[in-house]
């Protein structure tokens, strides 16, 4: 779970160790604040749960790619 200390800075201290199916993901945001111990990705699932993930992992990178392509493609 992301942890908001002195909002609005949200940090991740631990990453999920489970790969999440891309079908369960709705969006993501990058955590890059130098106030945080590490850069991270926070995925938001289709049930609005937020999950911290390691941006160095290939499945995380692939999921971000998928979401970015999906966001830009107009939904018909």
């Amino acid at each position: 779970q992301p942890d908001a200390i002195n909002a609005p800075v949200t940090c991740c201290y631990n990453f999920t160790n489970r790969k999440i199916s891309v079908q369960r993901l709705a969006s993501y945001r990058r955590i890059t604040s130098s106030k945080c111990p590490k850069e991270a990705v926070i995925f938001k699932t289709i049930v609005a749960k937020e999950i911290c993930a390691d941006p160095k992992q290939k499945w995380v990178q692939d999921s971000m790619d998928h979401l970015d392509k999906q966001t830009q493609t107009p939904k018909t």
Epitope: P37, E39, T71
Partner: antibody, heavy 117, light 107 residues
Framework: QVQLVQSGAEVKKPGSSVKVSCKAS????????MHWVRQAPGQGLEWMGR????????KFDPKFQGRVTITADTSTSTAYMELSSLRSEDTAVYYC??????????WGQGTTVTVSS | DIQMTQSPSSLSASVGDRVTITCKAF??????RAWYQQKPGKAPKLLIH???SLEHGVPSRFSGSGSGTDYTLTISSLQPEDFATYYC?????????FGGGTKVEIK
């Protein structure tokens, strides 16, 4: 706060090599990627490559492949960039920068490398 | 490599002016672009990354927009400290590439 401090200016002969260091403070380099970007006098920015200090995995612009070596020492939080077979066109300011996503949140102050006979 | 074409290469403007810099990628980069500001003798400074993410401490007069291959940096009201060179960069795929830069000068 995050700081990247680079080694001093270098003057090199054509054909020789140069090794530039970048010491990080305020962050654990194994949590990020360390990149090298250069800028020739009066010119734009050119990405050279990056290292994941956690596993020493590297990625380079094919233009520099074989001529550049990027290493990192997590025990001293230092990244290094070595460029070999120097030519006059390599005269530039060399920057280290950090960022896991492919953009660069923090930069070193730059190291001027002059290649001249 | 994904080529990034930035325009104009230079512009003259006055304090208070609205300034727009454009960047065109030679293929879709899905909003994965960053904007940097660089002053003479200094390292570049990250302003914006991704769709709209303004870096911490960057004034709200800076904004980014665009999608697909076309992106824009807007400075809504130019301040004296904004005279500098601006670069766009794509981070959709390595090798990461930069635009040629736009030098914003005092009119």
């Amino acid at each position: 706060q995050v700081q990247l401090v680079q080694s001093g200016a270098e003057v090199k002969k054509p054909g020789s090599s140069v090794k530039v260091s970048c010491k990080a403070s305020g962050l654990t380099i194994s949590h990020t990627y360390m990149h090298w970007v250069r800028q020739a006098p009066g010119q734009g920015l050119e990405w050279m490559g990056r290292i994941d200090p956690e596993n020493h995995n590297t990625k380079f612009d094919p233009k520099f492949q074989g001529r550049v070596t990027i290493t990192a020492d997590t025990s001293t939080s230092t990244a290094y960039m070595e460029l070999s077979s120097l030519r006059s066109e390599d005269t530039a300011v060399y920057y280290c920068a950090r960022g896991v996503f492919g953009f660069f949140e923090h930069w070193g102050q730059g190291t001027t490398v002059t290649v001249s006979s | 490599d994904i080529q990034m074409t930035q325009s104009p290469s230079s512009l003259s403007a006055s304090v208070g002016d609205r300034v727009t810099i454009t960047c065109k990628a030679f293929e879709d980069i899905y909003n994965r672009r960053a904007w940097y500001q660089q002053k003479p003798g200094k390292a570049p400074k990250l302003l914006i990354h991704g769709a709209t993410s303004l870096e911490h401490g960057v004034p709200s007069r800076f904004s980014g927009s665009g999608s697909g291959t076309d992106y824009t940096l807007t400075i809504s009201s130019l301040q004296p400290e904004d005279f500098a060179t601006y670069y766009c960069q794509q981070f959709w795929s390595a090798p990461y590439t930069f635009g040629g830069g736009t030098k914003v000068e005092i009119k």
